[in-house]
């Protein structure tokens, strides 16, 4: 959950408590288990080669 009093994240990003900032949903492709990815709609999983080249 986003910290009280903080501005909402812009489109394509979601609040990360771990990073204490808005984070790019695009990065969920490489790091799908990041805390903020739950707030990103339909983030695609990483391709097989990116995770295990």
């Amino acid at each position: 959950e986003q910290a009280p009093g903080t501005a909402p994240c812009s489109r394509g990003s979601s609040w990360s408590a771990d990073l204490d900032k808005c984070a790019d949903c695009a990065s969920c492709r490489a790091r799908p288990h990041s805390d903020f990815c739950l707030g990103c709609a339909a983030a695609p999983p990483a391709p097989f080669r990116l995770l295990w080249p």
């Epitope: 984070a23 790019d24 949903c25 695009a26 990065s27 990116l50």
Partner: antibody, heavy 119, light 111 residues
Framework: QVELVESGGGLVQPGGSLRLSCAAS????????MSWVRQAPGKGLEWVAE??????????HYAESVKGRFTISRDDSKNSLYLQMNSLRAEDTAVYYC??????????WGQGTLVTVSS | DIQMTQSPSSLSASVGDRVTITCRAS??????????MHWYQQKPGKAPKLLIK???NLESGVPSRFSGSGSGTDFTLTISSLQPEDFATYYC?????????FGGGTKVEIK
């Protein structure tokens, strides 16, 4: 503020070894992927090696040009990144940059350290 | 490996000019939602600096005269009104897969 400071560069003979270090501060080092990127004199940027997180079993990846010769490592307790370079060649001469990123785009860069391989 | 082709390799422009740099990847670096293309600025003797990530997301603190666009294989970095501090070399980079590769760079010089 974020700071990445490389050290360990210098002049080395072909076939020699060198170990580069990068001291990080100002961000949660253990949460960030780290890479080394190099730039030969007057040339463009070349990605060299990457190391991921403890949760990824510190997975490493290398450019073909350095595979088997270079080893990337990190010490999260010291907020430090390393590059062990063995069997150095003239074509490894470059400024070596330490970079940090959560994923994808390289947000943080050090000032670079020059490695010169020459006899 | 994905090859990145940047053009032009150099250009001369005046303060106030609109400048466009293109980058073409040898294969698509986009999903239906995001493009894994990034742009950096490098000044002589300095480290590169991230300007734009994911094709069009301006990095915090970067002036709004910089913008990025494109998807698939073709991407563009635009400087709407060139300022004296913008004379530098610009690089694109993909993060679609390993190895990450950079374009050859575009040097923006003073006319």
């Amino acid at each position: 503020q974020v700071e990445l400071v490389e050290s360990g560069g210098g002049l080395v003979q072909p076939g020699g070894s060198l170990r580069l270090s990068c001291a990080a501060s100002g961000f949660t080092f253990s949460s960030y992927w780290m890479s080394w990127v190099r730039q030969a004199p007057g040339k463009g940027l070349e990605w060299v090696a990457e190391i991921r997180l403890k949760s990824d079993n510190y997975a490493t990846h290398y450019a073909e040009s350095v595979k088997g010769r270079f080893t990337i490592s990190r010490d999260d307790s010291k907020n430090s990144l390393y590059l062990q370079m063995n069997s150095l060649r003239a074509e490894d001469t470059a400024v070596y940059y330490c970079t940090g990123y959560y994923a994808d785009a390289m947000d943080y860069w050090g000032q670079g350290t020059l490695v010169t391989v020459s006899s | 490996d994905i090859q990145m082709t940047q053009s032009p390799s150099s250009l001369s422009a005046s303060v106030g000019d609109r400048v466009t740099i293109t980058c073409r990847a040898s294969q698509s670096v986009s999903t239906s939602s995001y493009s894994y293309m990034h742009w950096y600025q490098q000044k002589p003797g300095k480290a590169p600096k991230l300007l734009i990530k994911y094709a069009s997301n301006l990095e915090s603190g970067v002036p709004s005269r910089f913008s990025g666009s494109g998807s698939g294989t073709d991407f563009t970095l635009t400087i709407s009104s060139l300022q004296p501090e913008d004379f530098a070399t610009y690089y694109c980079q993909h993060s679609w897969e390993i190895p990450y590769t950079f374009g050859g760079g575009t040097k923006v010089e003073i006319k």
